[in-house]
């Protein structure tokens, strides 16, 4: 007997959905109705017979009564080929429900995607994820993809990008955004960093996660963060090969003063970069190749420096900087 | 069966932050369900604080929007209240608890707020 | 939010009796055939402890003389046969919509 595509959990907090077969039963997914958080993975299938069944340019304010009455809150759909106009139905319908955050993933988006109507609700996420989410669009995908939401969105994560750099001059200001994720993105590099973070559409980023994006030194990303006028207060450029020294003729960076976190970990140093903010609140080194210990000089002034998993760090060493939060435990780096 | 267990100081000092722990056994806090906060003043009836989910997904009460981080550390299997600048008002006992219908609960800790 | 209103606030009953307890929602607590009512017991310096959910369902290890019934806006938790353990504060809590809300609480005595 084959497996039931859903599984709602005996709190109706959880609803998973795989819809495996070549012909699922989509009504199924009837049992998730009750549930807070909706994973529904779609099997790498084409909707695009779905669009023969629905009339995308149906009023969806005569789903309104129902759509309320879902407690979805978080919703993940992935694995699947699904035609723009059937994303945006799906869009415009959900602008009815409680839903906060969504989640794409695994998703080929075919054609384009129309015009928000006049009379059209944007729907008031406050956290949009994509992780491999292609667009026939290219590089306009983000603006065309904006025009159905809210401005209130606080957290964008794009990773996996096919294209990671947006249009600019069509995207609109995200005034609530406070987090923006890049991360996994390997080819981004710094210049594509520049492209991706169009100047002044991003006013309100405190938390910027740039890990195993192909960054270079912290300075590129200083200077990249600095032409976009980009003031986070905290900076992940884990997961990166970063090189410790700066190239010469590269003009010196000034971090902005917001700057208080940086993580520096897994980033294969042999010693600590130049360039970094004269002052961090936090800044972690850990499990990179540092041989010894890191002078006075060569750290910015920092509360809280963590240093664990460097090969100069045997357990039992003393700590190596005053205020520092090493476990004198090596961790799994 | 699971078992929730607070943990954190018993005094707080006024405009301070209250931090507490949850400690989850006999069940994974990154399996499934929401896994909340929950405070009751002296006295008082019962006030939802917010939860995170097993995704790490957070829901706050708006009343208290503003002042509260819930987070988790998943290699312990704890999960964690943060709440600013607290006064008297936020004197109560504070209870983890799991699930949206509220089933499993930690046996509470009172955290008293004064200088 | 969704306001709970519980009646009444207290009252006492003796052993035997059966016990109504009363909650009405400021606006529906179901989605689609659930509703999202739970009720809880908390007796003197203990954590509540869950009685009924989804309006009508006894939870595990909760005693028959317990039920619930209600929909939409308007429930009740009925104790059968009053005992003298059953000594409390009862609380109905919707998790409909967040932020998830509780009643008052009702607190039963023994005459």
């Known amino acids: 007997t084959t497996p039931e595509p859903c599984e709602l959990d005996d709190e109706d907090f959880r609803c998973v959905c795989n819809f495996s077969e070549p012909q699922p039963d989509w009504s199924e997914a009837f049992q998730c109705v009750s549930a807070v958080e909706v994973e529904i993975h779609a099997g790498g299938l084409n909707l695009e017979p779905f669009l023969k069944r629905v009339d995308a340019d149906a009023d969806p304010r005569q789903y309104a009564d129902t759509v309320k009455a879902l407690r979805v809150r978080r919703l993940t759909v992935g694995a699947a080929q699904v035609p723009a106009q059937l994303l945006v139905g799906a869009l415009r319908v959900l602008a009815y429900s409680r839903l906060k955050e969504l989640t794409l993933e695994d998703l080929k988006i075919t054609g384009t995607m129309p015009p928000l109507p006049l009379e059209a609700t944007g729907l008031a996420l406050s956290s949009l994820r994509l992780r491999n989410v292609s667009w026939a669009t290219g590089r306009s995908w983000l603006a065309e993809l904006q025009q159905w939401l809210k401005p209130g969105l606080k957290v964008l994560s794009i990773a996996q990008a096919h294209s990671p750099a947006f249009s600019c001059e069509q995207v609109r200001a995200f005034p609530a955004l406070t987090s923006l994720d890049l991360s996994d993105n390997p080819g981004l590099g710094e210049r594509g960093l520049m492209a991706a973070l169009c100047p002044h559409k991003f006013p309100a980023i405190q938390n910027l996660a740039l890990r195993n994006t192909g960054m270079e030194t912290p300075t590129g990303v200083c200077a990249a963060l600095a032409a976009a006028g980009v003031q986070p207060h905290s900076l992940d450029l884990s997961h990166n090969s970063l090189r410790a020294t700066v190239n010469p003729s590269a003009p010196r960076c000034m971090w902005s003063s917001a700057l208080n976190s940086l993580n520096l970990s897994f980033a294969g140093l042999e010693q600590v970069p130049k360039g970094l903010p004269a002052k961090l609140r936090v800044l972690d080194l850990s499990c990179n190749r540092l041989n010894r210990a890191p002078q006075p000089d060569e750290l910015p002034e920092v509360d809280n420096l963590t240093l664990d998993g460097n090969p100069f760090l045997v357990p039992g060493t003393a700590l190596p900087h005053e205020g520092s939060m090493n476990s004198g435990v090596v961790p799994a780096c | 069966q699971v078992q929730l267990q607070e943990s954190g100081p018993g005094l707080v000092k006024p405009s301070e932050t209250l931090s507490l722990t949850c400690t989850v056994s006999?069940?994974?806090?990154?399996?499934?369900?929401?896994w909340n906060w929950i405070r009751q003043p002296p006295g008082k009836g019962l006030e939802w604080i917010g939860y995170?989910?097993?995704?790490?997904?957070?829901s706050y009460n708006p009343s208290l929007k503003s002042r509260v981080t819930i987070s988790r550390d998943t290699s312990k299997n704890q999960f964690s209240l943060k709440l600013s600048s607290v006064t008297a008002a936020d004197t109560a006992v504070y209870y983890c608890?799991?699930?949206?219908?509220?089933?499993?609960w930690g046996q509470g800790t009172l955290v008293t707020v004064s200088s | 939010d969704i306001q709970l209103t519980q009646s009444p606030s207290s009252l006492s009953a003796s052993v035997g009796d059966r016990v109504t307890i009363t909650c009405r929602a400021s606006?529906?607590?179901?989605?689609?055939?659930?509703?999202?009512l739970h009720w809880y017991q908390q007796k003197p310096g203990k954590a509540p402890k869950l009685l009924i959910y989804r309006a009508s369902n006894l939870q595990s290890g909760v005693p028959s003389r317990f039920s619930g019934s209600g929909s939409r806006t308007d429930f009740t938790l009925t104790i059968s046969s009053l005992q003298p353990e059953d000594v409390a504060t009862y609380y109905c809590?919707?998790?409909?919509?967040?932020?998830?809300?509780f009643g008052q609480g009702t607190k039963l005595e023994i005459k």
């Open positions: 995170i989910s097993y995704s790490g997904s957070t």
């Open positions: 006999g069940y994974s806090i990154t399996s499934d369900s929401a």
């Open positions: 809590q919707q998790s409909n919509e967040d932020p998830y809300t």
């Open positions: 608890v799991r699930g949206l219908r509220f089933a499993y």
């Open positions: 606006e529906s607590v179901d989605s689609y055939v659930n509703s999202f």
